[in-house]
Amino acid sequence: QKSSIEKCSVDIQQSRNKTTERPGLLNCPIYWQQLREKCLLFSHTVNPWNNSLADCSTKESSLLLIRDKDELIHTQNLIRDKAILFWIGLNFSLSEKNWKWINGSFLNSNDLEIRGDAKENSCISISQTSVYSEYCSTEIRWICQKELTPVRNKVYPDS
């Protein structure tokens, strides 16, 4: 039995997988900030988690996925005030009783130190200093991400 938020997350991920392959992204679009091999878009408005998820999808992106503590710290350094919370692509899976990224992988417990409860209808937000479990219906800002395509050096034959 999947919660409505889990269904929404799966549906959006599946619809993205069905779309035709697009050429790789070499540069970040206007208004997006580059952080290493990603482009990030920090919303200015607020939304519940599932609306934020959908908004990123309409931008051909996803809610932020954080690989490790180092990436978390670099992302937090881009947040300008301590009283701003941003949704990322991590929520509590009731069926699996674990934190689950929207790409289907589970949270490595060492990656993020989450403050708050792991329970139904809990989604993860980040601030300048911390990672919080908040109710998914809370309206806060969110971060979308696009992956940059690594540029490989092409070897051309002599002409």
Epitope: H44, P48, D81, A83, S130, S133
Partner: antibody, heavy 119, light 107 residues
Framework: EVQLVESGGGLVQPGGSLRLSCAAS????????MSWVRQAPGKGLEWVST????????YYADSVKGRFTISRDNSRNTLYLQMNSLRAEDTAVYYC????????????WGQGTLVTVSS | GIQMTQSPSSLSASVGDRVTITCRAS??????LNWYQQKPGKAPKLLIY???SLQSGVPSRFSGSGSGTDFTLTISSLQPEDFATYYC?????????FGQGTKVEIK
């Protein structure tokens, strides 16, 4: 209908303590950040403190940091402000308000409760 | 913190007048500005959020404009119930700060 009702104000001596409460109804309390804003007699509005919906994150004005503690009980739909080491300059009407995380404003306010710090 | 300065601090006007109140931030706050109305002995009421968005239930005679550091609240045709004190507030960064207020009195 959204309602916020403060209680717990009163007369207290300098150095004393007081706990304010704010009973909320008419909305999903746990989904909203909540704040305290105060207004000294005849003066303007001053933000005091904000707490996120889960209670995990809290923020304070420098003037109250280390003396006041904001908290909430989502099972009781109640917001609290524990005020210690009270000073004369803390005398004000204290309002409970919904909102306070950037960029949201305070869209609903309680009627206020008066705190008087005097010997 | 960011300082918010309102002008004038008070004004006298008649019913039907167009009233303009300005608010200036000590640094750019984009459009993170709200306007509140407060009547004596009552709690403040949110009128305008995000500089120009009208809060639900607020009469359309109230409007807000501006971005960056300079903002304006306009009452297109002052009504008897509009005599009150008006405050601007920035939500760009903590501490969240208010202007000192503008008292609108009956001429």
């Amino acid at each position: 209908e959204v309602q916020l009702v403060e209680s717990g104000g009163g007369l207290v001596q300098p150095g004393g303590s007081l706990r304010l409460s704010c009973a909320a109804s008419g909305f999903t309390f746990s989904s909203y950040a909540m704040s305290w804003v105060r207004q000294a007699p005849g003066k303007g509005l001053e933000w005091v403190s904000t707490i996120s919906g889960s209670g995990g994150s809290t923020y304070y004005a420098d003037s109250v940091k280390g003396r006041f503690t904001i908290s909430r009980d989502n099972s009781r739909n109640t917001l609290y402000l524990q005020m210690n080491s009270l000073r004369a300059e803390d005398t004000a009407v204290y309002y409970c308000a919904r909102g306070g995380l950037i960029p949201s404003g305070f869209d609903y306010w309680g009627q206020g409760t008066l705190v008087t710090v005097s010997s | 913190g960011i300082q918010m300065t309102q002008s004038p601090s008070s004004l006298s006007a008649s019913v039907g007048d167009r009233v303009t109140i300005t608010c200036r931030a000590s640094q750019s706050i984009s459009s993170y500005l709200n306007w509140y109305q407060q009547k004596p002995g009552k709690a403040p009421k949110l009128l305008i959020y995000a500089a120009s968005s009208l809060q639900s239930g607020v009469p359309s005679r109230f409007s807000g404009s501006g971005s960056g550091t300079d903002f304006t609240l306009t009452i297109s045709s002052l009504q008897p119930e509009d005599f009150a004190t008006y405050y601007c507030q920035q939500t760009y960064s903590t501490p969240l700060t208010f202007g000192q207020g503008t008292k609108v009195e009956i001429k």
